[in-house]
């Protein structure tokens, strides 16, 4: 037998995953190698990935994943029943939007089943880890000679989202920075017409309904200005291009969530 | 790119110890997804592993019972580097030693140039 | 522990030849194996990962196969410079990390 003894060495460190001695394997020690950390994040409030980085692992191992809200009326341990891999190796798990409640506190726990009492556990807030999709459908119209405003969509709850525009001509090397409330449009009050201006816009949920610090996705941009500002000098829109989401990555049809049952979840 | 750098005694008297150093270039040895191995080669047992280090969080080590009681592996954060100490060594212990790393999908990617240890009075 | 055992230990074979070097696990590794090319004086290097990844810059005339317990190396067209000994290690249940014994390759 050419089996392997792990130790620890020096005093400021751990004992490792196991140590094996003449013991039968039954009397084999809990491991102190830490499982890696699970990161969430709620997209859309549509679906929900949690994952972790299985190359943390010493050796290859699929790592389980089990969930539950506390002190809820979901606080039923449920297995997770769409992992996700990275080269053959559980790395993830997605949790559609039926398994998400955003205001209840979500328990997340890890085991190794090659030594199930190596497991840990997280509670984490949904509601500060929503991430919505970039914004949509952009469009620019002149207020005045020299006033333009710049409107939004979100594929979301608007009350529940502040947003970020960013602006700049084609001379600045920097963009301006502007944030906007929930009310998803902005007003430019001086413009001048010789230049070409580029907008773009990115949103986050917060702080109304959540405390998240993660934004969307830029939108894709939109310009205004040159030739085709004196084309039109009055009005002139034009929609950013769209950003499909597969019914893959959403994980099947998915249904946004009702701005009555965010208010109702929100307030409880 | 990383690179292995091994240094150290090539000869060792019998119940001595060995004692060699790895320096990493273009990795950390605290990388929390990589650990640092050593491994030696001789005629009569072919390639064998040794043991290896690892961080996550804290320090951990592996040691094969091929070598136990006698091995140390220690890494040194401030200098990017590894060692491996094997005491009270005897002419089994001769043979080339390397140093190497568990990269992607744990294959050893990167392995040092390798010492020849010959164990002599 | 987990043994290697690879097949033939040595092999002699001619330039532009197809060479077969086997390797076969005591349990099930899924595909947790590795190949390893070493020449004399110098350290192994990394042929092939999870049992058919080439490794980066490695020739694709290398290639590698088999899941469980049974894997392949395949080299298709030999070149000069494949004359070495070639090792398979497992990775799947570690420590201890194990390594077949090697098969000598040699020009004919």
């Known amino acids: 037998l050419n089996t392997t003894i792990l130790t620890p060495n020096g005093n400021e460190d751990a004992t490792t995953d196991f140590f094996l001695t003449s013991m039968p394997t039954d009397s084999l020690s809990v491991s102190t190698l830490p499982l890696p950390e699970v990161q969430c994040f709620v997209f859309n409030v549509e679906y929900m990935n949690c994952t972790w980085n299985s190359s943390s692992e010493p050796q290859p191992t699929n790592l389980t994943l089990h969930y539950w809200y506390k002190n809820s009326d979901n606080d039923k341990v449920q297995k997770c029943s769409h992992y996700l891999f990275s080269e053959e190796i559980t790395s993830g798990c997605q949790l559609q939007k039926k398994e998400i409640h955003l205001y209840q506190t979500f328990v997340v726990q890890l085991q190794d089943p090659r030594e199930p009492r190596r497991q840990a556990t997280q509670m984490l807030k949904l509601q500060n880890l929503v991430i919505p999709w970039a914004p949509e459908n952009l469009t620019l119209r002149k207020l005045s000679e020299s006033q333009l405003e710049l409107n939004w969509n979100n594929r979301f709850l608007n009350h529940c989202l502040e947003h970020l525009v960013q602006y700049r001509t084609d001379w600045d090397h920097s963009w301006t920075e502007q944030s906007v409330d929930y009310r998803h449009k902005f007003s430019l009050p001086s413009v001048d017409g010789q230049k070409r201006y580029t907008f773009r816009v990115r949103s986050r949920f917060n702080p109304l309904c959540g405390s998240a610090q993660h934004w969307s996705e830029w939108s894709h941009p939109i310009h205004w200005g040159s030739n085709s500002s004196k084309e039109n000098p009055f009005l002139f829109a034009l929609e950013a291009e769209q950003k499909l989401i597969s019914e893959e990555d959403l994980g099947g049809e998915q249904k946004l969530i009702s701005e009555e049952d965010l208010h109702h979840h929100h307030h409880h | 790119q990383v690179q292995l750098q091994q240094s150290g005694p090539g000869l060792v008297k019998p119940s001595q110890t060995l004692s060699l150093t790895c320096a990493i270039s273009?990795?950390?040895?605290?990388?929390?997804?990589a650990a640092w191995n050593w491994i030696r080669l001789s005629p009569s047992r072919g390639l064998e592993w040794l043991?290896?280090?690892?961080?996550?969080?804290?320090?951990?080590?592996d040691y094969s019972l091929s070598v136990k009681g006698r091995i140390t592996i220690n890494p040194d954060t401030s200098k990017n580097q590894f060692s491996l100490h094997l005491n009270s060594v005897t002419p089994e212990d001769a043979a080339v030693y390397y140093c190497?790393?568990?990269?992607?999908?744990?294959?050893?990617?990167?392995w040092g140039q390798g010492t020849l240890v010959t164990v002599s009075s | 522990d987990i043994q290697m055992t690879q097949s033939p230990s040595s092999l002699s074979a001619s330039v532009g030849d197809r060479v077969t070097i086997t390797c076969r696990a005591s349990?099930?590794?899924?595909?947790?194996l590795n190949w390893y090319q070493q020449k004399p004086g110098k350290a192994p290097k990394l042929l092939i990962y999870?049992?058919?990844s080439l490794q980066s810059g490695v020739p694709s005339r290398f290639s590698g196969s088999g899941s469980g317990t049974d894997f392949t190396l395949t080299i298709s067209s030999l070149q000069p410079e494949d004359f070495a000994t070639y090792y398979c290690?497992?990775?799947?249940?570690?420590?201890?990390?194990?390594f077949g014994q090697g098969t000598r390759l040699e020009i004919k």
């Open positions: 190497a790393r568990t990269g992607r999908r744990w294959s050893l990617d990167y």
């Open positions: 273009g990795d950390s040895v605290s990388s929390n997804i």
């Open positions: 043991g290896r280090t690892f961080f996550r969080s804290t320090w951990f080590y």
């Open positions: 349990q099930s590794i899924s595909s947790y």
């Open positions: 999870a049992a058919s």
């Open positions: 290690q497992q990775s799947y249940s570690t420590p201890p990390i194990t």
